[in-house]
Amino acid sequence: KSSNEATNITPKHNMKAFLDELKAENIKKFLYNFTQIPHLAGTEQNFQLAKQIQSQWKEFGLDSVELAHYDVLLSYPNKTHPNYISIINEDGNEIFNTSLFEPPPPGYENVSDIVPPFSAFSPQGMPEGDLVYVNYARTEDFFKLERDMKINCSGKIVIARYGKVFRGNKVKNAQLAGAKGVILYSDPADYFAPGVKSYPDGWNLPGGGVQRGNILNLNGAGDPLTPGYPANEYAYRRGIAEAVGLPSIPVHPIGYYDAQKLLEKMGGSAPPDSSWRGSLKVPYNVGPGFTGNFSTQKVKMHIHSTNEVTRIYNVIGTLRGAVEPDRYVILGGHRDSWVFGGIDPQSGAAVVHEIVRSFGTLKKEGWRPRRTILFASWDAEEFGLLGSTEWAEENSRLLQERGVAYINADSSIEGNYTLRVDCTPLMYSLVHNLTKELKSPDEGFEGKSLYESWTKKSPSPEFSGMPRISKLGSGNDFEVFFQRLGIASGRARYTKNWETNKFSGYPLYHSVYETYELVEKFYDPMFKYHLTVAQVRGGMVFELANSIVLPFDCRDYAVVLRKYADKIYSISMKHPQEMKTYSVSFDSLFSAVKNFTEIASKFSERLQDFDKSNPIVLRMMNDQLMFLERAFIDPLGLPDRPFYRHVIYAPSSHNKYAGESFPGIYDALFDIESKVDPSKAWGEVKRQIYVAAFTVQAAAETLSEVA
């Protein structure tokens, strides 16, 4: 239970006072205010919004609100030389061109500075050649093409449908397959829900709608020119040839009307199975090239975007802690959008704004949190999590010593079905306890708790009567805090009932149609889901900043470590002969997990019994909890991914959005049967088991009695 003893404040100022102050109507008003014009990173409009937020946070009562600026590599289309893709005939004449911009939504026809759809950081180029359809361009899709179908993508332009995995992974896979260009498109199978009208009459993607997005493979580096260090005034910048994560081939996104024109003429091989077919009226032939009558026609890309070092601005607000001002609980979400940002990010930014307002109201009445709360409005998230990463790089020494927790606050909704939470196991009990105290906004669950509706609609696959909580992956601003610095992190939002479509996003994601009206008309007219998300995010921050003992349960880490060890062992056991031949043993890992479990259990017992009135002991126990996440950090990082340093979790090497457990071992085992030197490959597996076992054991020891 949360307690206010140490903060010397009136009983009125408890969690309930904070939660009661949050209002749906305010979130609605803030969302409207944040979505009337585009706020693309690096633009004057986004700088003005940063200054507005700074001013309002000060008015709300924060102790200080500063802008933190960095000069980072961004990418923009050429205003006078638009990007497009053509079908050309044998004479080189363009017989079809993809659209130059999206048809604007009603009411926004005269808005200027709507950036046309583009793939941020695509190099310039005008490749032409035959088309190959590569499904989602996942690792397994290229395996199917190259190994089973014997189709060579070398020198071809590949067309891939969005969805399932992060677009940057698609581009990386295409590059490795030898493609000379990539076309990304949204298939109605993934971005058009049956029975729903397209925008502006519903929340589905129209044929002219296009998903923007960056196509970097940064692996946590931040600004591509200053990996590991802040992009400040005296930064040393790499040359563009040495920049981290930039794609080497032109890439461009299109909508399904344009995709129809490219795909309807495809010839070559038939799709290998039904999982390669979308919902367009086309054969989904793989190619290469066009069929019969059209075999002399080619596809040509015209990409003229430029990479530019541009100033970005984070807004950092501080609410100083009364008792432990040197312990930081951070609530952060981004401000920059591709266009209007109706959902991404402003549905999150509006919630953060209301949380700040509520905390400010309490502060004006004389209350302070026990620990310091930092609020952040990050810039350039859409360009590779740049604002948050640069700030964390600049403040890494403070953060690694003082960072208690990071709560992310991007889009508050991606649907209106149920809650979705991804977090460190340390926060499981916090989330469970909090959601039991909150009212469910769901129809049919009036008078019931959020925990109850969430558990009913999204049950845990392992534990009955509990809700699903997922692993943290990446693709958002928690990345640097969790994966690089080892600060306990979590995120929460309302989601859809599309478990199969987990990583495709909502239909209008990153399109011009992501407007205020989309949210107000179709997703959350009463803003009740936004309010619930504000209560969850704000409630987590409140508890993390105010509870005397940190609301972390290390026993939950023990449980998942065992689960992850079992999982990785079973993957390895698909190769029993090799494990025997190369003497591969997981004994050290299972032993370490057993030790962790026992030590965590004893620590939890001590946590119940220690004298909480002794500030030294209290601080000691809290520090052990705070530093537990940090203990899973390997300073050397993962192989070829130095900024992914968490040994238990990393973004999947095949999908940045997804989290992978024991990623070092997982990657060493992946496709091991195809490795040219099995002895070396299995040696790396053994090394990764050693690193994982050591790290788990070392983390366990941080929970042992100190002397």
Partner: antibody, heavy 125, light 111 residues
């Protein structure tokens, strides 16, 4: 009320030029493809040209290719047909028409759902 | 010579049913491109009657229906009325011409 109003027709000598305009109102012009269609005296309808909403694509009937240019000014909600090197066989009533929204394709690959009343072009010496 | 072939004229008595055919080829109707039908009284704006082979815009009576099969399409009018006497055109897209094509038109006479 959705409306298309053509103007700019008239009598012109062979080899000369003429520019037709079509003013659109009552709908979001910038989001629609637009066509020109003509009807010569005593003949049927003949498609002339089409332009996509963003001018990324323009297509012409073989009979006018290289002589006619379709364009649009989305800020003025106006469609144009610039007709050069006019011939006697270009004599017709010229209609502008809005492309029809339907199916899994750009509207300009579909039919035409809203038509203007037409403007008459006579090419005669 | 139109790419889409229609009969020059058809006729029927009031209350009767008439059909107007529209025959194309493998590069237009047969290539799965939609067929649209228009009613045109000379000197006025043509009116969309049927779109996407068989769909009626709002305001068009259900006496008008369209169908498509293979390389041809047809327009059926039931319960003929005097005001139906005018010209009817079919239209589709032709991939070999990269253009939009009309039939030559059919004059409907209500006897």
């Amino acid at each position: 009320e959705v409306q298309l109003v053509e103007s700019g027709g008239g009598v012109v000598q062979p080899g000369r030029s003429l520019r037709l305009s079509c003013a659109a109102s009552g709908f979001t012009f910038i989001t629609y493809g637009m066509h020109w269609v003509r009807q010569a005296p005593g003949k049927g309808l003949e498609w002339v040209a089409v332009v996509s909403f963003d001018e990324s694509n323009k297509y012409y009937a073989d009979s006018v290719k290289g002589r006619f240019t379709i364009s649009r000014d989305n800020s003025k909600n106006t469609l144009y047909l610039q007709m050069n090197s006019l011939r006697a066989e270009d004599t017709a009533v010229y209609y502008c028409a809005r492309a029809l929204r339907d199916g899994n394709n750009w509207d300009y690959f579909n039919g035409m759902d809203v038509w203007g009343q037409g403007t008459t072009v006579t090419v005669s010496s | 010579q139109s790419v889409l072939t229609q009969p020059p004229s058809v006729s029927g008595a009031p209350g009767q049913r008439v059909t107007i055919s529209c025959t194309g080829s493998s590069s237009n109707i047969g290539a799965d491109y939609d067929v649209h039908w228009y009613q045109h009284l000379p000197g006025t704006a043509p009116k969309l009657l049927i779109y996407g082979n068989s769909n009626r815009p709002s305001g068009v009576p259900d006496r008008f229906s369209g169908s498509k099969s293979g390389t041809s399409a047809s327009l059926a009018i039931t319960g003929l009325q005097a005001e139906d006497e005018t010209d009817y055109y079919c239209q589709s897209y032709d991939s070999s011409l990269s253009g939009w094509v009309f039939g030559g038109g059919t004059k409907l006479t209500v006897l």
